[in-house]
Interface confidence: low
């Protein structure tokens, strides 16, 4: 499969196989590279209430518990991203695992992740049969963290 | 620049420009895609003690504070990864911001991130002048989280 760097794609390496293979097996293998959140999704139902479990994955044992929301885009690499959604506005008491402690806020930790979007190639013979990968920064929430509130101005 | 999918590279799209351009400008632009941790590095000195600040970035305000350690590999995409290093074995008291609360553990949240390594291409004419990208899962610690200890068996 012939690939090209596309100047129109942010001057970044862009792979443009024939559209006959759209989506080609290679694309599927590559784009499904990162499909799992840091903690197993099978357990996230434990965290669906504002409490900290004493067992299970980190997102349910954390005193800033969170669940994962799937963000799927078949024209993106990776296709699947997971956003952490905080289940409590405040942190859960370490003592009880259920009551909220107003001295702490449960807040998402954001990260600008590099992703690649599959776009039509420009300035290329037979553009209808080619595509390129366009790099973008995409904001994802990785987890929820228990923090001390900011000092009031 | 002509690019090829290399069967020897995990059957994944692999871009093999001439080695004359090693490292080509395109590679540098792409591989430096993700060079910043979720929180500004300029502030991490605030977190270099086992306490939770009331100001600054999340990693220093968290009651499971962490600093970032740079992991640089010029033959990897992204070249720069940041590992969260927990500064306290236990969580910091929300009340004082300094004392550790033995009821909570400060633990790293790990994630298998997709990275691409630049490798010599195999089974290719003039292999000494080409390289491919090989996908790998690479474990990074994203942040530190305050959790309730697991139930003892």
């Amino acid at each position: 499969v012939s690939l090209r760097i596309q100047e129109g794609c942010s001057h970044l390496p862009s792979c443009c196989p024939s559209k006959e293979q759209e989506p080609p097996e290679e694309w599927l293998k590559w784009s499904s590279a990162s499909v799992s959140p840091p903690e197993p999704l099978s357990h996230t139902h434990h965290a669906e209430s504002c409490r900290a479990s004493k067992d299970g994955p980190l997102n349910s044992r954390a005193i800033s518990p969170w669940s994962y929301e799937l963000d799927r885009d078949l024209n993106r690499v990776p296709q699947d991203l997971y956003h952490a959604r905080c289940l409590c506005p405040h942190c859960v008491s370490l003592q009880t695992g259920s009551h909220m402690d107003p001295l702490g806020n449960s807040v998402p930790l954001y990260h600008n992740q590099t992703v690649f979007y599959r776009r039509p190639c420009h300035g290329e013979e037979g553009t209808h049969r080619r595509y390129c990968l366009e790099r973008r920064l995409y904001r994802v929430s990785l987890a929820c963290v228990c923090v001390r509130p900011r000092v009031m101005a | 620049v002509s690019l090829r999918i290399q069967e020897g590279c995990s059957h994944l799209p692999s871009c093999c420009p001439s080695k004359e351009q090693e490292p080509p400008e395109e590679w540098l632009k792409w591989s430096s895609a993700s060079v910043s941790p979720p929180e500004p590095l300029s502030h991490t000195h605030h977190a270099e003690s086992c306490r939770a600040s009331k100001d600054g970035p999340l990693n220093s305000r968290a009651i499971s504070p962490w600093s970032y350690e740079l992991d640089r590999d010029l033959n990897r995409v992204p070249q720069d990864l940041y590992h969260a290093r927990c500064l306290c074995p236990h969580c910091v008291s929300l009340q004082t911001g300094s004392h550790m609360d033995p009821l909570g553990n400060s633990v790293p949240l790990y994630h298998n991130q997709t990275v691409f390594y630049r490798r010599p291409c195999h089974g290719e004419e003039g292999t000494h002048r080409r390289y491919c990208l090989e996908r790998r899962l690479y474990r990074v610690s994203l942040a530190c989280v305050c959790v309730r200890p697991r139930v003892m068996a």
Partner: antibody, heavy 117, light 111 residues
Framework: QVQLVQSGAEVKKPGASVKVSCKAS????????IEWVRQAPGQGLEWIGQ????????NYNEKFKGRVTITADTSTSTVYMELSSLRSEDTAVYYC??????????WGQGTTVTVSS | DIVLTQSPASLAVSPGQRATITCRAS??????????MHWYQQKPGQPPKLLIY???NLESGVPARFSGSGSGTDFTLTINPVEAQDTANYYC?????????FGAGTKLELK
């Protein structure tokens, strides 16, 4: 402005109980600990215990455990300190203080409790 | 319990002079880069007033002539220069471990 207003003076007999109140205003009541400290006549300060009203979490000085109960009513922003099985040595001025970082940045005016037969 | 020993028990200082009060803890009150020692002023018939928190931090609204120093087990409250309204009892308090404890107090009088 932050204010802590305590209930009036009490005279009790030995063996009785006393309940002192501390009404807070001017800040987020649930987010700060309330400390209780007492001072016997001509003596120094002695910490009794503390409560975080938002979750009802308490810590007590072992010396008073079993005799003291600290509670909070978030609907009225009031904290109560009840001391039972009173004895003459419990005669003191009882103070409430807003605690942050385990030091008192604002204090009530004090409540005099006299234990006498 | 951590015992705090204040000295002197009382002192008399002329206005404009320096007053130094010390507080020694029976064990360290330091944790993770902070010294959990605080200083209060108490005038007759009034509640204590916070002057210094965590060894050296001046509480908002407290005059700059008050300062605190020290770490580990030895701490000092300095008033320089002393003014007439500084006549009071001064107490140190530790919060590094429960129970919170106070020193017996130092009575400052003016000459």
């Amino acid at each position: 402005q932050v204010q802590l207003v305590q209930s009036g003076a009490e005279v009790k007999k030995p063996g009785a109980s006393v309940k002192v109140s501390c009404k807070a205003s001017g800040y987020t009541f649930s987010s700060y600990w309330i400390e209780w400290v007492r001072q016997a006549p001509g003596q120094g300060l002695e910490w009794i215990g503390q409560i975080l009203p938002g979750i009802g979490s308490t810590n007590y000085n072992e010396k008073f455990k079993g005799r003291v109960t600290i509670t909070a009513d978030t609907s009225t922003s009031t904290v109560y300190m009840e001391l039972s099985s009173l004895r003459s040595e419990d005669t003191a001025v009882y103070y409430c203080a807003r605690g942050y970082g385990n030091y008192g940045d604002y204090w009530g005016q004090g409540t005099t409790v006299t234990v006498s037969s | 319990d951590i015992v705090l020993t204040q000295s002197p028990a009382s002192l008399a200082v002329s206005p404009g002079q320096r007053a130094t009060i010390t507080c020694r803890a029976s064990e360290s009150v330091d944790s993770y880069g902070n010294s959990f020692m605080h200083w209060y002023q108490q005038k007759p018939g009034q509640p204590p007033k916070l002057l210094i928190y965590r060894a050296s931090n001046l509480e908002s609204g407290v005059p700059a002539r008050f300062s605190g120093s020290g770490s580990g087990t030895d701490f000092t409250l300095t008033i320089n220069p002393v003014e007439a309204q500084d006549t009071a009892n001064y107490y140190c308090q530790q919060s590094n471990e429960d129970p919170l404890t106070f020193g017996a107090g130092t009575k400052l009088e003016l000459k």
